[in-house]
């Protein structure tokens, strides 16, 4: 015989769940023991069966889970899974916060990405700081020339996707350019999107020829300027 224990504690590390109103929330407390334990759920210390909740709840005992769809502010609280058998019991608390802020288009920090000048062979980092209520997705684009033109017949620029990423809110997204050459020079765009819309800002990368060390030593006062 064995008291209940968590089988996947790493899946329970996210204690605070802050989700936008209307989203689905799933709490899991995967456990085992001998005899096989049962699971009960409490909300703010009281037995929770979801009977007073519009839309109810889904309890999937074989998955040790509680699912609530279309959460509303009244769903806020502490949710406790109580796992017990004849030998003992264990419990774990989840905190649910339902966010009511109006989700908006991603906001990009002014001045990022920044115009940058680099020397051939050097490494470059372009930064993009995104603020978004909904989880944003990011694309780094390079504006390219096709048949001698930067724009198509529709007036829109030709772009090439360099990198795509899904990031958490308020993270800094970085585009790394290693060992840059003259071909890397040009306009780069950080495009951020979420369920509400897209926002994007651009910067120029200027790539200078490799400095001749003898020329630099002989004429230290001569320097490239923007």
């Amino acid at each position: 015989q064995q008291a209940p224990y968590w089988t996947h504690p790493q899946r329970m590390e996210k204690k605070l769940h802050a989700v936008p109103a209307g989203n689905t929330v799933k709490f899991r407390c995967p456990a085992a023991g001998n005899p096989t334990p049962t699971i009960r759920w409490l909300k703010d210390g009281q037995a929770f069966h979801g009977e007073n909740r519009i839309g109810g709840i889904r309890l999937r005992h074989q998955h040790w889970s509680l699912v609530m769809e279309s959460v509303v502010p009244s769903d806020r609280g502490t949710y406790t899974c109580l796992v017990e058998n004849a030998v003992g019991s264990i419990r774990y608390n989840y905190l649910l916060d339902v966010l009511e802020r109006s989700p908006h288009r991603p906001i990009l920090q002014a001045g990022l990405p920044a115009n940058t000048t680099a020397v051939v062979g050097s490494d470059v980092e372009l930064l993009c700081k995104v603020y978004s209520d909904a989880q944003p997705h990011i694309q780094w684009l390079k504006h390219i020339v096709i048949n001698g033109s930067s724009f198509g017949a529709d007036g829109f620029p030709y772009v090439q996707v360099l990198k795509t990423a899904d990031i958490n809110s308020s993270e800094v997204e970085v585009l790394y350019l290693r060992n840059v050459s003259a071909e890397d020079a040009g306009e780069y765009t950080c495009l951020a999107g979420n369920s509400i819309g897209l926002s994007y800002q651009s910067a120029w990368l200027t790539v200078l020829p490799e400095e001749d060390p003898t020329w630099t030593a002989a004429a230290p006062e001569a320097r490239y300027t923007d």
Epitope: S102, H104, R105, V159, G193, N194, S195, G197, L198, Y200
Partner: antibody, heavy 124, light 112 residues
Framework: EVQLLESGGGVVQPGRSLRLSCAAS????????MHWVRQAPGKGLEWVAV????????YYADSVKGRFTISRDNSKNTLSLQMNSLRVEDTAIYYC?????????????????WGQGTMVTVSS | DIVMTQTPLSLSVTPGQPASISCTSS???????????VYWYVQKSGQPPQLLIY???NRFSGVPDRFSGSGSRTDFTLKISRVEAEDVGVYYC?????????FGGGTKVEIK
Amino acid sequence: EVQLLESGGGVVQPGRSLRLSCAASGFTFSSYAMHWVRQAPGKGLEWVAVISYDGSNKYYADSVKGRFTISRDNSKNTLSLQMNSLRVEDTAIYYCVRGAGRGFPYGPDGFDIWGQGTMVTVSS
Amino acid sequence: DIVMTQTPLSLSVTPGQPASISCTSSRSLLHSDGKTYVYWYVQKSGQPPQLLIYELSNRFSGVPDRFSGSGSRTDFTLKISRVEAEDVGVYYCMQYIEAPLTFGGGTKVEIK
């Protein structure tokens, strides 16, 4: 041709449920957020809900929060709206609308393509 | 929520004459990326809305150049330089900067 086609409307009693569907074609459905907008008879337009391209984010108008659920099946190019606890004031034409895509916006980033709409009448 | 207020409620125009519709938002629609997220639609009888203008002043593909959008921050205008019979319908402005997305109450354009 880019198209959105709604279905599932009908007459239903207050308190009952209805499920609307929207079939998308002519574009990469899984790359776009999708919205529902409704219009009560003789009235203006009211935004109802949005779902992100992968279904991970959903937002609702206060008037339907807790009663309506937006969902999508990218494998079937289908958007759905599950409407529970229907009220007389939910009577409207429901439009499926394409939202923002994931790539560079060659034109508007959404709200450019609308379906023909499906009529929902809630009446006792 | 952002409130969109449209004027006038209705408009009766002689063909070939100009028409102007105003829309005011309760908050600025100028976003950090420099764009102003106001859209204009026309809804003809028995049809879904059709996009005319996006991001304040950009004409959607296929929209005649007699339609133009202008304004800044909270005050917006849709102009039809020479109204034609096919322009009858209800015109709506919409803010597309945050949820809930909101529409103006509509302006009904009729031909004299």
